[in-house]
Interface confidence: medium
Amino acid sequence: TEVKVTQPEKSVSVAAGDSTILNCTVTSLLPVGPIRWYRGVGQSRLLIYSFTGEHFPRIRNVSDTTKRNNMDFSIRISNVTPEDAGTYYCVKFQRGSSEPDTEIQSGGGTEVYVLAK
């Protein structure tokens, strides 16, 4: 069966300077390939976090994704700023051998509202 990516929150509100968690789980780790978080859609979408080892300031994974069979790819964004407002998507990719990774499934998106402190 096809992997399913779930983002249960439709929206979260967070005060500027605080941190927030964006929840995402998958039903399967197959096919092999990374999970990435983006803000926005289409040409304007911005890579926010990738579960592939790179360092992303202010953002970290919530659960230990190195553990076998971990299906939780939630992230915590700390010190939120107004520029962080937008819709965040958790996206599953299939790893390509020579070609680029292929996007196979996206969560429904979580809108982040940033409130003035």
Partner: antibody
Amino acid sequence: EVQLVESGGGVVQPGRSLRLSCAASGFTFSSYDVNWVRQAPGKGLEWVSLISGSGEIIYYADSVKGRFTISRDNSKNTLYLQMNSLRAEDTAVYYCAKENNRYRFFDDWGQGTLVTVSS
Amino acid sequence: ETVLTQSPGTLSLSPGERATLSCRASQSVYTYLAWYQQKPGQAPRLLIYGASSRATGIPDRFSGSGSGTEFTLTISSLQSEDFAVYYCQQYYDRPPLTFGGGTKVEIK
């Protein structure tokens, strides 16, 4: 106070059409996703369809896909359900339900309107 | 699609007794579960969300617990107005949103 008032129900023959309306008041209608949920006589609740606040995102239950169309007019604070090719198994009370703004559970419901499909 | 199974189908109890209703999910829904009460001829009313948080205006004799696939709604001391049908609903999975089949709490 949130109010959801359904109308448009009635008796209709199989294969015919009907349009339900749900008039909303007491909240910023365009900011909320709204749903239709139905209940056949003596049975449980069955989710039918959902439409996002902007109208851009729509989902249907498999049982009504291709026959029912959900829509909304935010200028009139009204939700609609166009029901075509009606079947006996569509007989139910149809409720309009407002979702919570963060999650997909229902914090406000209308009183319901009865649709009876019978020849 | 996540299937919710409620048990028992009917619970016959007397006023003042404790009612324990069960809802089991076919796959984990974490704590994304709501409970509703429905009286004859009325629309459902939200009781519990997030598996254990009471909705506004709901008396504290109603409590919810559980996570993952096993959930419980408890009414600590049944009042006459509590005799009704109770439904659980998961909102973790993407639509279709699903309800349990309901548990009727009736007067013994």
